[in-house]
């Protein structure tokens, strides 16, 4: 992927070309400024809490700090989903929620955060050193995952502080490349503005050099540098993850991937497919590792006026309060 940006000529402009050159000088900073403003790095936070009432009961809360539209959230334990982790719950904003034991209640707390309560009894109950991971699939940011666990010395009732610990994924390589381009653009914009401020008024004399202005090129990482970005998952071994759930979901991915609509999910690819998979353009981002967007351009439709069940800004917890007639 290559993007070319026209830069002003280094020599004074030719007579009659001053308007065109001035226009080009003005347009480029605005284009770059727009890119700078819209470029942001999303982050996932994970908070694990052991309930004081039930010592083996956990509440996991996860959130996505990004501007994109979340299309799927997967909560797993024992490591990242797809790398030995076992799926506990999957939350789809437009199709619903699916959970597996020992998950007791998965729910959306806000448009960008979820919570999951785990039961604390039986062979499948978690223990204090279990690692919990949350993966958020979002457009246009892609797939972001973070993991957290309860500190070994935690007292019951206390929670681990939210841990934004994103795991670099193969499907982020393209985004990182774009971020690099944008960063370069921002730096270049500052340089351009600074130079523009200090530049003396140009003399209107014909150019002695070629009329073709030199071009500055900004490009995405090469294949080699993209490959360098492909960091494998951090695999966490825990002593208390039940083997019974592993047989149910051997790869951490439930068996329903094929049943979801094409814009929601596909069965994940193995890490071997990473290096050979080209990084797509941001506009039609397709997740490399788990192919969550076949039609990434789709945005969730708006709900009709006055027909929402609970459009309460407090989220689903508003349900627990007194029910008013809408």
């Amino acid at each position: 992927m290559r993007t070319e940006a026209q830069v002003p000529a280094l020599q004074p402009p030719e007579p009659g070309l001053e308007g065109a050159m001035g226009h080009r000088t003005l347009v480029l900073p605005w284009v770059l400024l727009t890119l700078c403003v819209t470029a942001g790095t999303p982050e996932v936070w994970v908070q694990v809490r052991m309930e004081a009432t039930e010592l083996s009961s956990f509440t996991i809360r996860c959130g996505f700090l990004g501007s994109g539209s979340i299309s799927l959230v997967t909560v797993s334990w024992g490591g990242p989903n797809g790398a030995g982790g076992t799926t506990l719950a999957v939350l789809h904003p437009e199709r619903g929620i699916r959970q597996w034991a020992p998950a007791r209640q998965a729910r959306w707390e806000t448009q960008s955060s979820i919570s999951l309560i785990l039961e604390g009894s039986g062979a499948s109950s978690p223990c204090a050193n279990t690692t919990f991971c949350c993966k958020f699939a979002s457009f246009p940011e892609g797939s972001w995952e973070a993991c957290g666990s309860l500190p070994p010395s935690s007292d019951p009732g206390l929670s681990a502080p939210p841990t934004p610990a994103p795991i670099l994924r193969a499907d982020l390589a393209g985004i990182l490349g774009v971020s690099g381009v944008l960063l370069f653009g921002c730096v270049y914009l500052l340089h351009l503005l600074r130079r523009h401020k200090h530049r003396p008024a140009p003399r209107l004399q014909p150019s002695r050099t070629s009329p073709q202005a030199p071009r500055a090129r900004a490009w995405a990482p090469s294949q080699a540098s993209q490959a360098a970005l492909h960091v494998p998952y951090a695999t966490i071994n825990t002593s208390c993850r039940p083997a019974t759930l592993d047989t149910a979901h051997p790869h951490g991915g439930p068996s329903w991937w094929a049943s979801l609509p094409t814009h929601a999910a596909h069965r994940p690819q193995g890490p071997a497919a990473w290096a050979s998979t080209p990084i797509p353009a941001r506009g039609s981002f397709v997740s490399v590792e788990n192919g969550l967007y076949a039609q990434a351009g789709e945005r969730p439709p708006h709900t009709g006026p006055g027909l929402t069940l609970f459009p309460d800004p407090r989220g689903p917890r508003a349900m627990e309060g007194p029910l008013g007639v809408r």
Epitope: P93, E94, W108, Q111, T303, F310
Partner: nanobody, 118 residues
Framework: EVQLVESGGGLVQPGGSLRLSCAAS????????MGWYRQAPGKDRELVAT???????KYVDSVKGRFTISRGDAKNSLSLQMNSLRAEDTAVYYC????????????WGQGTMVTVSS
Amino acid sequence: EVQLVESGGGLVQPGGSLRLSCAASETYFDLYVMGWYRQAPGKDRELVATITYTGSIKYVDSVKGRFTISRGDAKNSLSLQMNSLRAEDTAVYYCNADPSGLGRKVYWGQGTMVTVSS
């Protein structure tokens, strides 16, 4: 797209009973909130009762003690048992589903008519 299909409406005398049912096409995910709304002729649509997939239930005051909402054995099936029906319960009853509970995407059935008249 989640499809909701209601059934069970009809004509009943005051004090009688009816059972409305709603079946959702979504059979993999649990729909976080499902509920019943009604719209009487010439009036706005109003909430009757809701139930979350974890079993939390709410009723509007005017139907408390008379109506019972429940989720069936089949995934995402919903029913509304209506007892001690009154003339003011006459309306088109709509099944509603909010998969996330956030109102981001809400689905509606086509409605079933309930007429309470002697």
